[in-house]
């Protein structure tokens, strides 16, 4: 289960746009042993993104994260700076992978689908806890996300790694419960759907959850990277990770140059992931997608899938 | 078209508390935040928190912490602010607002609710 | 929490008149400002964000610009309709702050 301590697992070559701090609940930093130093950000609805550590916005988005997680650990709360070796966060099951992100399979296993099931680790985080996060990183918790500009214009350009799925009942939250706030975010074209960080203790009531509806690409994101235009995601969704395409749809079109290699070490049976697969089905990538990796989804921590749409994801609640 | 349609004026006494909806049509009602600010008379504008209607997760505006209570109904794409123990400087015209998911500008408002405290 | 400051706090100015609305901010909010107009008695309306990104619908005479701490909202001719109150908005962190607005008047 250990593999490597000094082996680079993520390595990011397309950084992100801005984000805005309050969309963002932590960040972490790749080893030194991948070279080129980039910040992993993530966000309200789960997603990491590359950043660059040299630009000013991150910079103060690490510092402002780091201020809170000091808040919230004056406050009761529990956090934890992990450096070491980074390895696959263990909450996340499904998510969307932009085309800077390959997986690099470090094992194979004999089933073809992830069944992770909830834990605890929703509440951690909700108290401010980090328990997934990959160790071998300086890492830090902070809070919330997401703005949208304009009708549908594309999102950050960045390095979307790995997006986790949401739950789509509605809950009652009394300010003040302690919690990590839902999703938000600017850069996918096709979904909006939100995690499943609700805090049980604060959960007054849950709503029921709304009737699949016609999506609207993109529906609730608008973008900050400057002017480019999403092209409309497909419903991606599958049950057998076979080669993992670019995954671009909601970010400037970029080359298959424009990669980041995530190598995902496996989880061992112990791990208990927090959230529920979002995919099932099968799904052929687009021609013009460079397939950048093959995995078994067995063994991953971290079940890389394209976002699927937000109602498809609520069918399957 | 979208439309966020908020409950009518409530009076209310030093103390009380009031609930606030915002029904919302002519979008997903899950795929975006609800934000709630509120203007005092002749003032300016101040956020008091968001929900999240796809998860109900929230965020408040610290100075509003432990009297907010923000709900959303899915069912029905409607989203609640409750404030308790109200003085008379809560005295304002409470806005829902619609916050896309890439960041928290508020492109759709409510008509506003106006709120008084008196006793 | 950051502050922004908006100036002038009410001007008045002529229908086809060019006019230039300021905000600060007490930190660096990376341009993720907003932009809102709001007349008497209504909800404010959503216009500029990103710093310059135009609402939809709204007309092109408004613009928005800005780095850092400093942003501006300019109306390039300003129209009968354009005579309302301007607030900004910085969604770069928590809390959300709003400028004190600008009242634009006729002259």
């Known amino acids: 289960q250990h593999h490597g301590v000094t082996k680079c697992n993520i390595t990011c070559s397309k950084m992100t746009s801005k984000i805005p701090v309050a969309l963002l609940i932590h960040y972490q930093q790749n080893q030194a042993s991948c070279g080129k130093r980039a910040i992993i950000l993530e966000t309200r609805q789960h997603r990491l993104f590359c950043a660059d550590p040299k630009e000013q916005w991150v910079k103060d988005a690490m510092q402002h994260l780091d201020r809170q997680a000091a808040a919230l650990t004056r406050n009761g709360g529990t956090f934890e700076k992990q450096i070491g070796e980074v390895k696959p966060r263990t909450t996340p099951a499904a998510g969307g992978m932009d085309e800077s992100v390959v997986l690099e399979p470090e094992a194979t296993g004999e089933s073809s689908s992830l069944e992770p099931t909830p834990s605890s680790q929703e509440a951690q985080r909700a108290l401010g806890t980090s328990p997934e996060l990959p160790t071998g990183v300086t890492g830090s918790s902070g809070t919330r996300l997401p703005p949208t500009p304009k009708a549908q214009d594309g999102g950050p350009v960045g390095t979307e790694l790995f997006r986790v799925p949401p739950v789509s009942t509605a809950a009652t939250w009394q300010s003040s419960a302690p919690h990590q706030p839902g999703p938000s975010l600017w850069a996918e074209a096709k979904t909006s759907e939100a995690p499943s960080t609700q805090d049980p203790s604060t959960q007054a009531s849950t709503a029921s959850s709304p009737a699949p509806e016609e999506n609207a690409p993109s529906e609730g994101q608008r973008v900050w990277g400057q002017g480019q235009s999403p092209r409309p995601e497909n419903s991606l969704e599958r049950e057998e990770m076979g080669p993992v395409p670019a995954h671009t749809d909601a970010f400037q079109d970029w080359g298959p140059g424009s990669m980041a290699h995530v190598s995902v070490v496996p989880v061992s049976s112990e791990g208990t992931p927090s959230r529920e697969p979002v995919a099932s089905g099968s799904w052929t990538p687009k021609a013009e997608e460079p397939i950048h990796a093959t995995m078994d989804p067995q063994r991953l921590g971290v079940l890389i899938t394209p976002v699927p749409d937000a109602q498809a994801a609520t069918r399957r609640q | 078209q979208v439309q966020l349609v908020q409950s009518g004026a409530e009076v209310k006494k030093p103390g009380a508390s009031v609930k606030v909806s915002c029904k919302a049509s002519?979008?997903?009602?899950?795929?975006?935040?609800i934000h709630w600010v509120r203007q005092a008379p002749g003032q300016g504008l101040e956020w008091i928190g968001w929900?999240?209607?796809?998860?109900?997760?929230?965020k408040f505006n610290e100075r509003f912490k432990g009297r907010t209570t923000m709900t959303a109904d899915t069912s029905t794409s409607t989203a609640y602010m409750e404030l308790s123990s109200l003085r008379s400087e809560d005295t304002a015209v409470y806005f829902c607002a619609r916050g896309p998911t890439d960041g928290d500008y508020f492109d759709y408002w409510g008509q506003g609710t106006t709120v008084t405290v008196s006793s | 929490d950051i502050q922004m400051t908006q100036s002038p706090s009410s001007l008045s100015a002529s229908v086809g008149d060019r006019v230039t609305i300021t905000c600060r901010a007490s930190?660096?909010?990376?341009?993720?400002l907003a932009w809102y107009q709001q007349k008497p008695g209504k909800a404010p309306k959503f216009l500029v964000y990103?710093?310059?990104t135009l609402a939809d619908g709204v007309p092109s005479r408004f613009s928005g610009s800005g780095s850092g701490t400093q942003y501006t909202l300019t109306i390039s001719s300003l129209q009968p309709e354009d005579f309302a109150t301007y607030f900004c908005q910085q969604f770069w962190s928590t809390p959300y702050t709003f400028g004190g607005g600008t009242k634009v008047e006729i002259k």
């Open positions: 930190g660096n909010i990376h341009n993720f």
């Open positions: 929900i999240y209607p796809g998860d109900g997760s929230p």
């Open positions: 990103n710093e310059k």
């Open positions: 002519g979008y997903t009602f899950t795929n975006y935040y």
